[in-house]
């Protein structure tokens, strides 16, 4: 899988969307979690509606919400009063028996808000030097991660 | 009527490849998943994998990978099973099979099955 | 991978009996479980679904019970074309292993 890289501002709310195929995932509840580590496990945050058939109403773990159009075939994730710890590699999952299936990668990362005066230096960027050209946009917040970069800020 | 047409018995020997089909019909082929199943003389039924017509997702039972292919043309609502180098031990009646859509359940119902294709390799 | 043991290998009943037929996961399956029937020289047939959800066109005399790694299926009272090998099949973890079958034969 690509990675999808979405951007959004600390403090405001960054909506994730996440297509896929409505009937090859039909009846399956979806997830999203947190990658951690490179290698590690992904840790579920939120998942939709224990229903199936209720996945359109929105579910809320603390200040993520997941909603599934699985006629059309999106999962939205919002992240509401974006905060820098927010930023990372994520997971649309498509969950069928026990195992779940990768629908996207997402790497979120968070910008500073302009009109926030105080010290970003909290704020982690992916390296400055990394070109983006031929990146897909699907939105002015997202892009593809190119081949070569590193989805995780490096550790000190 | 919705259904699944497959091929016919093959007779085959040893070292000798061979693919098998097996045609939907009724439903759109590009929306449901297909699984394959083994079943050798007097024996139960054995998973050997599934796919996804509409973009060939393939997931093979480890005991069958590297056995066999299995594939899918969405043109002509068709999946497909395959050997490069058959085996006497290869002998069976292999069954395709429709897993159905089950709103609020995502386990794997197989709910319409194709006749069989009886595969014998003998020298 | 999931191993799925049915018991007993042959059940020896007569028509209007209460036929029991147990299937044990290795592992739990949660409700990730169906059954199918298979007759000599036909192909299987979707019994039961998600452990006790019937299938389309099923008659009610089959019911189908149990979670985790205990399950059953139940003919209320057998009739003629109910004799034969008997299937479960878990979808919980790939790959969709299936039991060794359990065959009801006349008594």
């Known amino acids: 899988h690509n990675t999808t890289v979405f951007q959004g501002v600390a403090g405001q709310s960054l909506q994730v969307s996440c297509p896929y195929d409505s009937m090859k995932h039909w009846g399956r509840r979806k997830a999203w979690c947190r990658q951690l580590g490179e290698k590690g496990p992904c840790q579920r945050v939120v998942s939709t509606h224990n229903l199936w058939l209720l996945s359109f109403l929105r579910r809320w773990n603390g200040s993520t919400a997941i909603t599934d159009d699985t006629l059309g075939g999106t999962l939205t994730i919002t992240l509401r009063n974006l905060q820098p710890h927010d930023a990372g590699l994520y997971q649309c999952q498509s969950l069928h028996g026990s195992e779940a299936d990768t629908l996207r990668k997402v790497l979120v990362e968070v910008l500073a808000d302009p009109l926030d005066h105080r010290d970003a230096g909290d704020l982690w960027f992916p390296g400055e030097s990394e070109s983006f050209e031929d990146a897909h946009v699907e939105h002015s917040i997202s892009r593809s991660l190119l081949e070569g970069e590193i989805p995780f800020p490096p550790t000190s | 009527e919705v259904q699944l047409v497959q091929s016919g018995a093959e007779v085959k020997k040893p070292g000798e490849s061979l693919k098998i089909s097996c045609k939907g019909s009724g439903y759109s082929f590009t929306s449901y998943w297909i699984g394959w199943v083994r079943q050798m003389p007097g024996k139960g039924l054995e998973w050997m994998g599934i796919i996804y017509p509409g973009d060939s997702d393939t997931r093979y039972s480890p005991s069958f990978q590297g056995q066999v292919t299995i594939s899918a043309d969405k043109s002509i609502s068709t999946a497909y099973l395959q050997w490069s180098s058959l085996k006497a031990s290869d002998t069976a009646m292999y069954y395709c099979?429709?897993?159905?859509?089950?709103?609020?359940?995502?386990?794997?119902?197989?709910?319409?099955w194709g006749q069989g294709t009886m595969v014998t390799v003998s020298s | 991978e999931i191993v799925l043991t049915q018991s007993p290998a042959t059940l020896s009943l007569s028509p209007g009996e209460r036929a029991t037929l147990s299937c044990r996961a290795s592992q739990s399956v949660s409700s990730y479980l169906a059954w199918y029937q298979q007759k000599p020289g036909q192909a299987p047939r979707l019994l039961i679904y998600d452990a006790s959800k019937r299938a389309t066109g099923i008659p009610a005399r089959f019911s189908g019970s149990g979670s985790g790694t205990d399950f059953t299926l139940t003919i209320s009272s057998l009739e003629p074309e109910d004799f034969a090998v008997y299937y479960c099949q878990q979808s919980s973890v790939h790959p969709y292993t299936f039991g060794g079958g359990t065959k009801v034969e006349i008594k």
């Open positions: 099979a429709r897993a159905g859509h089950y709103d609020d359940w995502s386990g794997l119902g197989l709910d319409v």
